[in-house]
């Protein structure tokens, strides 16, 4: 029961985490800054991974996409890549973990297969969470680096003056969403890995079985008993087939050249 709960909770936490990673990746508020403040209108800028937006105190907003790939900083490309890899891994992990859930029965899937799938999805969630945390942290570092470079320059260009002002960017809401979502995905992945240990058959308690041959050319068929974890239908070591086999509890057998223990 505890294993099922751990696995289910891990799945739900990871699901929330991956939804958060997707939300953070799509959000425009990765960084925010005050552009300028004339006596009438305050103008703000917020930037995401895909576009930049300018919002005015009046509520008017205009957004423009980063249409060029070559002109974008390598760091931004790296952040985009990390977030997308995180989403893809997380989505695959979710798909795998659905089939791995203890409460869902798919055909005659063995517990060992479910354990493997749980472990696989857990690792995927951990890597997905790490990718998101890394992506958000790289972006945050980019902003912190720029924070200490507040400068203003004025130079004469063709047809007038060009004024460049380095305003201070601050962390946007998407960074916090990304950090939390990455953390949740990571925690969910760890929970899935813990649940995997409980699902895997740790020991195989076979009862000794003596097979009594009825003829001289009877072949031994292995696998008379299934290893049980206590969760399947075969909770006690029951006979699967009867072909001349008796457990030692049932009959006292005498050694012969056809006995296999």
């Amino acid at each position: 029961m505890a294993v099922t709960a751990c696995q289910g909770l891990g799945f739900v936490v990871s699901l929330i985490g991956i939804a958060g990673i997707i939300a953070a990746t799509c959000m425009d508020q990765w960084s925010t800054q005050d552009l300028y403040n004339n006596p009438v209108t305050a103008v703000f800028n917020y930037q995401g991974l895909w576009r930049s937006c300018v919002r005015e105190s009046s509520g008017f907003t205009e957004c423009r996409g980063y249409f060029t790939l070559l002109g974008l900083p390598a760091m931004l490309q790296a952040v985009r890549a990390l977030m997308i890899v995180g989403i893809v891994l997380g989505a695959i992990g979710l798909l795998v973990s659905i089939f791995a859930l203890k409460c869902i029965r798919i055909g005659s899937m063995e517990d060992s297969a479910k354990a493997n799938m749980t472990l696989t999805s857990g690792i995927m969630f951990i890597v997905s969470g790490l990718c998101a945390i890394a992506g958000v942290s790289v972006f945050a570092n980019m902003l912190v680096t720029n924070f200490w470079m507040s400068t203003a320059n004025m130079y004469t260009g063709m047809g007038g003056m060009v004024q460049t002002v380095q305003t201070r960017y601050t962390f946007g809401a998407a960074l916090f969403v990304g950090w939390v979502a990455g953390g949740l995905t990571l925690i969910g992945g760890v929970m899935m890995c813990i649940a995997c240990r409980g699902l895997a058959p740790e020991e195989t308690n076979y009862k000794a079985v003596s097979y009594h041959a009825s003829g001289h050319s009877v072949a031994y068929k292995p696998g008379g008993f299934k290893a049980s974890t206590g969760f399947g239908s075969n909770t006690k070591n029951k006979k699967i087939y009867d072909g001349g086999a008796r457990t030692e509890d049932e009959v006292q057998s005498y050694p012969s050249k056809h006995d296999y223990v």
Epitope: V54, T164, Q166
Partner: nanobody, 124 residues
């Protein structure tokens, strides 16, 4: 880069009208908004009016000119106009056109382009 050239300034009587223009050339697609500022001798440069270049062209004005001045734009001609009515002697100043480039660089610098200015003198 964006180049700005102002024109239309001159001498006008108090209570009269004047229209100044600002023609933009170069990378005008990168402009977010355009504004007019003025600087009287011995004073600091002050904001007059602004207009958003695209998306409906929302406007804002300094309290001192509200109701008297009107800012407009013609994106086809890449020109911004400032229609000045009921002029007062205190409106005498050098009028500068300013374009603000839409910030498309993460953590990058904000770029403002300024024209050379056009002189407006209001006589009493």
């Amino acid at each position: 880069q964006v180049q700005l050239v102002e024109s239309g300034g001159g001498l006008v009587q108090a209570g009269g009208s004047l229209r100044v223009s600002c023609a933009a050339s170069g990378r005008t697609s990168s402009i977010y908004d355009m504004a007019w500022y003025r600087q009287a001798p011995g004073n600091e440069r002050e904001f007059v009016a602004r207009i958003v270049w695209r998306s409906g062209g929302s406007t804002s004005y300094a309290d001192s000119v509200k109701g008297r001045f009107t800012i407009s734009r013609n994106t086809a001609k890449n020109t911004v106009y400032l229609q000045m009515n009921s002029l007062k002697p205190e409106d005498t100043a050098m009028y500068y056109c300013r374009a603000f480039e839409f910030p498309l660089q993460i953590g990058g610098q904000n770029v403002y382009y300024w024209g050379q200015g056009t002189q407006v003198t209001v006589s009493s």
